[in-house]
C-alpha cells in the first residue's frame, strides 16, 4: 500500500533570464527512493539515480543543473519554459509517486513564489 505523499513548491513564477529551483519531497513513507525523474510535459529533463548519479538530458545540459538534493535548477529561463513540471519518484517497495509543479516565467520583474501544497 502506498502511504507516501509528495510535497512540491506548487505554483511558482520567475523572471525571464533568471533561474528557479524545482523541488519535491516525499514524506509519510519508509520506502527507499531509487530514482527521481524530472519531466516537462512529456520531455525528460533529468534523472537522479541512487546508484548512478545524475543524467541530464543533452538538450538541456547547458541550462539545467542538478540539485539541490533531488531537486533541479533551471537557468536562463525563457517564456517558453512556462508550463507543468513533474517529479516522478521511483521507490521500493511502494512504486511510483508523482508530483506536479506549475512554473510561469514572467517578462516583468515581479515574480513571486506560490504557496507550497501537497499531492497525495
Amino acid at each position: 500500500m502506498m502511504t507516501g505523499t509528495i510535497e512540491t513548491t506548487g505554483n511558482i513564477s520567475a523572471e525571464k533570464g533568471g533561474s528557479i529551483i524545482l523541488q519535491c519531497h516525499l514524506s509519510s513513507t519508509t520506502a527507499q527512493v531509487t530514482q527521481v525523474n524530472w519531466e516537462q510535459q512529456d520531455q525528460l529533463l533529468a534523472i537522479c539515480n541512487a546508484d548512478l548519479g545524475w543524467h541530464i538530458s543533452p538538450s538541456f545540459k547547458d541550462r539545467v543543473a542538478p540539485g539541490p538534493g533531488l531537486g533541479l535548477t533551471l537557468q536562463s529561463l525563457t517564456v517558453n519554459d512556462t508550463g507543468e513540471y513533474f517529479c516522478i519518484y521511483h521507490t521500493y517497495p511502494d512504486g511510483t509517486y508523482t508530483g506536479r509543479i506549475f512554473l510561469e516565467v514572467l517578462e516583468s520583474s515581479v515574480a513571486e513564489h506560490g504557496a507550497r501544497f501537497q499531492i497525495p
Epitope: 531509487t34 534523472i47 539515480n49 546508484d51 548512478l52 541530464i56 538538450s59 511510483t96
Partner: antibody, heavy 119, light 107 residues
C-alpha cells in the same frame, strides 16, 4: 553523422598498463557521457564505467574500481580509458559508446579496440 | 546487482518468421531496458531503449515491450540481415548489466 573512432589494437604483457582512446565527431562532445564496455573472446558484454564529458565525473562498476581510469580531453573531443595491472583475462575487445539521450544506455558505439595480454 | 537473463540462448528461424526473445530482470527495473544487435566482428548497435522506443534508423519490424521484470524483443518478419546476436541491458542501477545474449541463426 555521429562517429566514434577508437585507437588500434594493443598487445601488452601481464602487469603492464594500456590506454585506449575514443575520438568523437558529429555532435557536441560535452553534452553526452562516454561509456566503456568490454567483450572477452566468444563472450558477452560487460560494462566497465562511464564519464560525464561535461563535468569529468566518472562512475565505475565495482569490479573495475582501481583497475580502469577514465578521462576526457574536451579540446579534441576524445575520451580515454586506462587499464592497469593487466592480466591474461583482461584480453578483450574494448568499446567506447556514447550515452543515450534519455538515460544510461549506449546510443552509438565505436568500432572496438582489441587488447591482448600475453607473456 | 540486477541480473538479466535472456531466453532462449539461441534459436533457428527462417526469413519471414516472427521471432521473440525474452529478457527477465532479477528485480523491477520499470521500463529501463535496452536491446542491442551485434553481428560477428562488429560493434553492437542500439535497437530499443526504455523498453519500447526505437531510435531513428531502426526498422519498424523491431519492437519492444514489457515493464517491471519481464521484457520482449520481437522481430515481426525476420530479414536476412537480422541474423545476429541480441543483448538486453538494464539502465536502472550500478552495475549496468547485460543479458548473456541470444543468437539468431538461419534454419
Amino acid at each position: 553523422q555521429v562517429q566514434l573512432v577508437q585507437s588500434g589494437a594493443e598487445v601488452k604483457k601481464p602487469g603492464a598498463s594500456v590506454k585506449v582512446s575514443c575520438k568523437a565527431s558529429g555532435y557536441t562532445f560535452t553534452r553526452y557521457s562516454m561509456y566503456w564496455v568490454r567483450q572477452a573472446p566468444g563472450q558477452g558484454l560487460e560494462w566497465i564505467a562511464f564519464i560525464d564529458a561535461y563535468s569529468g565525473g566518472s562512475t565505475y562498476a565495482q569490479k573495475f574500481q582501481g583497475k580502469a581510469t577514465l578521462t576526457v580531453d574536451t579540446s579534441i573531443s576524445t575520451a580515454y580509458m586506462e587499464l592497469s595491472r593487466l592480466r591474461s583475462d583482461d584480453t578483450a575487445v574494448y568499446y567506447c559508446a556514447r550515452g543515450g539521450d534519455y538515460g544510461w544506455y549506449l546510443g552509438v558505439w565505436g568500432q572496438g579496440t582489441l587488447v591482448t595480454v600475453s607473456s | 546487482d540486477i541480473q538479466m537473463t535472456q531466453s532462449p540462448s539461441s534459436l533457428s528461424a527462417s526469413v519471414g518468421d516472427r521471432v521473440t526473445i525474452t529478457c527477465r530482470a532479477s528485480q523491477s527495473i520499470y521500463s529501463y531496458l535496452s536491446w542491442y544487435q551485434q553481428k560477428p566482428g562488429k560493434a553492437p548497435k542500439l535497437l530499443i531503449y526504455n523498453a519500447k522506443s526505437l531510435p531513428s534508423g531502426v526498422p519498424s519490424r523491431f519492437s519492444g515491450s514489457g515493464s517491471g521484470t519481464d521484457f520482449t524483443l520481437t522481430i515481426s518478419s525476420l530479414q536476412p540481415e537480422d541474423f545476429a546476436t541480441y543483448y538486453c541491458q538494464h539502465h536502472y542501477g550500478n552495475p549496468l548489466t547485460f543479458g548473456q545474449g541470444t543468437k539468431v541463426e538461419i534454419k
